[in-house]
Interface confidence: medium
């Protein structure tokens, strides 16, 4: 869920999760267009991961799962079902991805009308 997403991002990366709430074309609710930078690509990848989880019958934004922040790393589990496993992997992936990025202030509160209608395909 959203709480776990914020927690995992805070565990691994140097910035507050709030820094990604309205960033670029994909960080925040919804998303379309061409990702603006590495951070935006992380968020695009996470959107794709959540889409795959939804296709598997999961509820990414609301479903809770167990995880631990150990040594600045996300440890998933113990999972009670496949959805919890998938969702933790999605959040773990974006947390690791964001931790390796440079932050570009110019993409904070980026106007959505500047984002193209079409988006890159998910892997």
């Amino acid at each position: 869920g959203i709480l776990e997403l914020a927690g995992t991002v805070g565990c691994v990366g140097p910035r507050t999760p709030i820094a990604y709430m309205k960033y670029g074309c994909f960080c925040g609710l919804g998303g379309h267009g061409q990702p603006r930078d590495a951070i935006d690509w992380c968020c695009h990848g996470h959107d794709c991961c959540y889409t795959r989880a939804e296709e598997a019958g999961c509820s990414p934004k609301t479903e809770r799962y167990s995880w631990q922040c150990v040594n600045q790393s996300v440890l998933c589990g113990p999972a009670e079902n496949k959805c919890q496993e998938l969702l933790c992997k999605c959040d773990q992936e974006i947390a690791n991805c964001l931790a390796q990025t440079e932050y570009n202030l110019k993409y904070l509160f980026y106007p959505q009308f500047l984002c193209e209608p079409d988006s890159p395909k998910c892997d």
Partner: antibody, heavy 121, light 107 residues
């Protein structure tokens, strides 16, 4: 209570090797990173690097790459700092410090008492 | 690497006075900064984390402020046990460097 207890003072000659230990107690050793900090006589603190206690993966600050090695004996909740080919400028007090890395709680919350290393011919 | 600079390098003050020391970073740290106190011959002790949060057991006369690249540690009504060296340390990205320290001495 939580404690980090380091090995005693060391007197070594240039070119020798030293291994300093840091034994942790009072918490789950593999849940927190272990950091090493150098303090030369009369000088400030220098972060040497840290070791992930759940994987044993070390990270070294640039200045401490090469002759310095972090290791673990997880079963004994002990971290080690080994310095090879000792030089006079290695004379310092070395601290181990437990790292808490969950934002915003990022800090070194428990420190060892320090191990004084003197390198002299 | 992020450079941390502390000022002043040394400071003398009397018991009861208020002192402020600063820490500057070469890059935006947001609030990823901690302050430590170290007394002669002892290990450092955590005072403040996340720039403004007092660690457990730290007296309320200590306070941290700032974000981004400029941070301060303020000590109100100095007590005899407050004298020693103070270090800031960033936790933005490794290496987690320390500032050069501020030595607080009794006037």
């Amino acid at each position: 209570q939580i404690q980090l207890v380091q090995s005693g003072p060391e007197l070594k000659k240039p070119g020798e090797t030293v291994k300093i230990s840091c034994k942790a107690s009072g918490y789950t050793f593999t849940n927190y990173g272990m950091n090493w900090v150098k303090q030369a006589p009369g000088k400030g603190l220098k972060w040497m690097g840290w070791i992930k206690t759940n994987t044993g993966e070390p990270t070294y600050a640039e200045e401490f790459k090469g002759r310095f090695a972090f290791s673990l004996e997880t079963s004994a909740s002990t971290a080690y700092l080994q310095i090879n080919n000792l030089k006079n400028e290695d004379t310092a007090t070395y601290f181990c410090a437990r790292g808490n890395y969950y934002r915003p709680r990022r800090y070194f919350d428990y420190w060892g008492q320090g191990t004084t290393l003197t390198v002299s011919s | 690497d992020i450079q941390m600079s502390q000022s002043p390098a040394s400071l003398s003050a009397s018991v009861g006075e208020t002192v402020t020391m600063t820490c500057r970073a070469s890059e935006n740290l947001y609030s990823n900064l901690a302050w430590y106190q170290q007394k002669q011959g002892k290990s450092p002790q955590l005072l403040v984390y996340a720039a403004t949060n007092l660690a457990d057991g730290v007296p309320s006369r200590f306070s941290g402020s700032g974000s981004g690249t400029q941070f301060s540690l303020k000590i109100n009504s100095l007590q005899p046990e407050d004298f020693g060296s103070y270090y800031c340390q960033h936790f933005y990205v490794t290496p987690y460097t320390f500032g050069g320290g501020t030595k607080l001495e009794i006037k």
